[in-house]
């Protein structure tokens, strides 16, 4: 199992700080973390160093070290907070797509753990969440909307209380896709049609579950008909 230095689960630094993270394993090791600027990677056999001499709020996140050759698949992690008074949030993705009844993680990471007590989730333009929205917060990961519903497909913002005022993150668009319970019911009307060449003919093809995204088309032999 690889080991990370510094040997703490969390590291809190100020913007502009120099940060050095070292991972040591038995074999070669690899780092995985939030996509962020300023990191330099030095690898040397069984050790790998991630370093920056100008940490920014965008470096906030969990850095995981793995040993690809380890059959046990062990890993080690450290969470870095770069506490920027002007930037309480580091948003890792601006669009999140899940299926209904899955948990939706909105990845806004708090840059200062002290602010955890004053966080909340809102819809854009300060609108409150829809009723029955069940969510939780983790400073390492962000807000999780539990068992997301199609109707919760909205734009959200993460809010933190700083010096008595609310500071919002950039918005995160949540898309909750309906789960198709089975193939849609298709009907083709009429079942039989006789026309003389040149006459007009109307065939109606309809499908149920129209709120789920899928294509409906007519096919004759192997030819897809233009509608």
């Amino acid at each position: 199992i690889p080991v990370i230095e510094p040997s703490v689960p969390e590291l809190v630094v100020k913007p502009g700080a120099t940060v050095t993270l070292r991972c040591v394993g038995n074999g070669s090791v690899e780092w995985d973390g939030p996509p962020s600027p300023h990191w330099t990677l030095y690898s040397d056999g069984s050790s790998s160093i991630l370093s920056t001499n100008n940490a920014t709020f965008q470096n906030t996140g969990t850095y995981r070290c793995t040993e690809p050759g380890d059959p046990l698949g062990g890993s080690a992690a450290i969470h870095l907070y770069v506490k920027d008074p002007a930037r309480p949030w580091n948003v890792l993705a601006q669009e999140v797509v899940v299926f209904e009844d899955q948990d939706a993680l909105l990845p806004c990471l708090l840059t200062d753990p002290v602010l955890e007590a004053g966080v909340s989730l809102v819809r854009v333009r300060g609108r409150p969440l829809m009723r029955h929205t069940n969510y939780s917060f983790s400073p390492w990961h962000g807000f999780t909307i539990h068992r997301a519903k199609f109707i919760q497909s909205q734009d959200y913002q993460c809010s933190a209380l700083m010096g008595g005022r609310k500071v919002m993150s950039i918005s995160i668009r949540l898309k909750v896709q309906k789960v198709i319970p089975g193939p849609p019911a298709l009907t083709l009307v009429p079942a039989e049609l006789v026309r003389i060449r040149g006459e007009a003919a109307q065939i109606v093809c309809s499908a149920s579950s129209v709120d789920v995204n899928f294509d409906v088309f007519l096919q004759h032999n192997n030819t897809k008909l233009a509608i």
Epitope: I1, V8, A77
Partner: antibody, heavy 118, light 107 residues
């Protein structure tokens, strides 16, 4: 409020064994790294052992002076950490503190005293 | 193992004075240093982490600085409640060694 409470200290003869316990509350214990630190007038503050969280494979680490004699363990269901001490020596005498590691040793218990003497 | 050398071992000062305690690591610890305060008969308390960051609730008269192998803890305008012992400790790997401590006494 984070609370750590050690127990199990006392007087033991050289070569004997003792098990210290630490009951934790006020935080998500299963996510925490827990350490034992001891203090004596002769040695000052001395780090003893560490056990990491399940996410870190419950990895354990020991000071060279206790390796092979002491064993750190945890029971997440009871929010407790333990230190089993065998082959005790007079130099193991001191106050043993249970600590939670976050950005440092963020929280400390009140300590329990171990005396190794004949 | 990384050794931590703390100085001075003791210091006799008056309320209102400014004091600086230093800590030297035997190798580069990349700012992974903590400072603790311990009052007589009590458990140590975290003061500073990552060399320069004050722990929650620590008064701003305390400040940490340093990098590489040299670190210091400065206390401006000492208050009566600041007297006690101070320890540094590194977090660059294990074992996590402490400095020998500095005892701050009232003159």
């Amino acid at each position: 409020e984070v609370k750590l409470e050690e127990s199990g200290g006392g007087l033991v003869q050289p070569g004997g064994s003792m098990k210290l316990s630490c009951a934790a509350s006020g935080f998500t214990f299963s996510d925490a790294w827990m350490d034992w630190v001891r203090q004596s007038p002769e040695m000052g503050l001395e780090w003893v052992a560490e056990i990491r969280s399940k996410a870190n494979n419950h990895a354990t680490f020991y000071a060279e002076s206790v390796k092979g004699r002491f064993t750190i363990s945890r029971d997440d269901s009871k929010s407790s950490v333990y230190l089993q001490m065998n082959s005790l020596r007079p130099e193991d005498t001191g106050i043993y503190y249970c600590t939670r590691v976050k950005v440092g040793f963020d929280n400390w218990g009140q300590g329990t005293t171990l005396t190794v003497s004949s | 193992d990384i050794q931590m050398t703390q100085s001075p071992a003791s210091l006799s000062v008056s309320v209102g004075e400014t004091v600086t305690i230093t800590c030297r690591a035997s190798e580069n610890i990349y700012s992974n240093l903590a400072w603790y305060q311990q009052k007589q008969g009590k458990s140590p308390q975290l003061l500073v982490h990552a060399a320069t960051n004050l722990a929650d609730g620590v008064p701003s008269r305390f400040s940490g600085s340093g990098s590489g192998t040299q670190y210091s803890l400065k206390i401006n305008s000492l208050q009566s409640e600041d007297f006690g012992s101070y320890y540094c400790q590194h977090f660059w790997g294990t074992p996590r060694t402490f400095g020998g401590g500095t005892k701050l006494e009232i003159k």
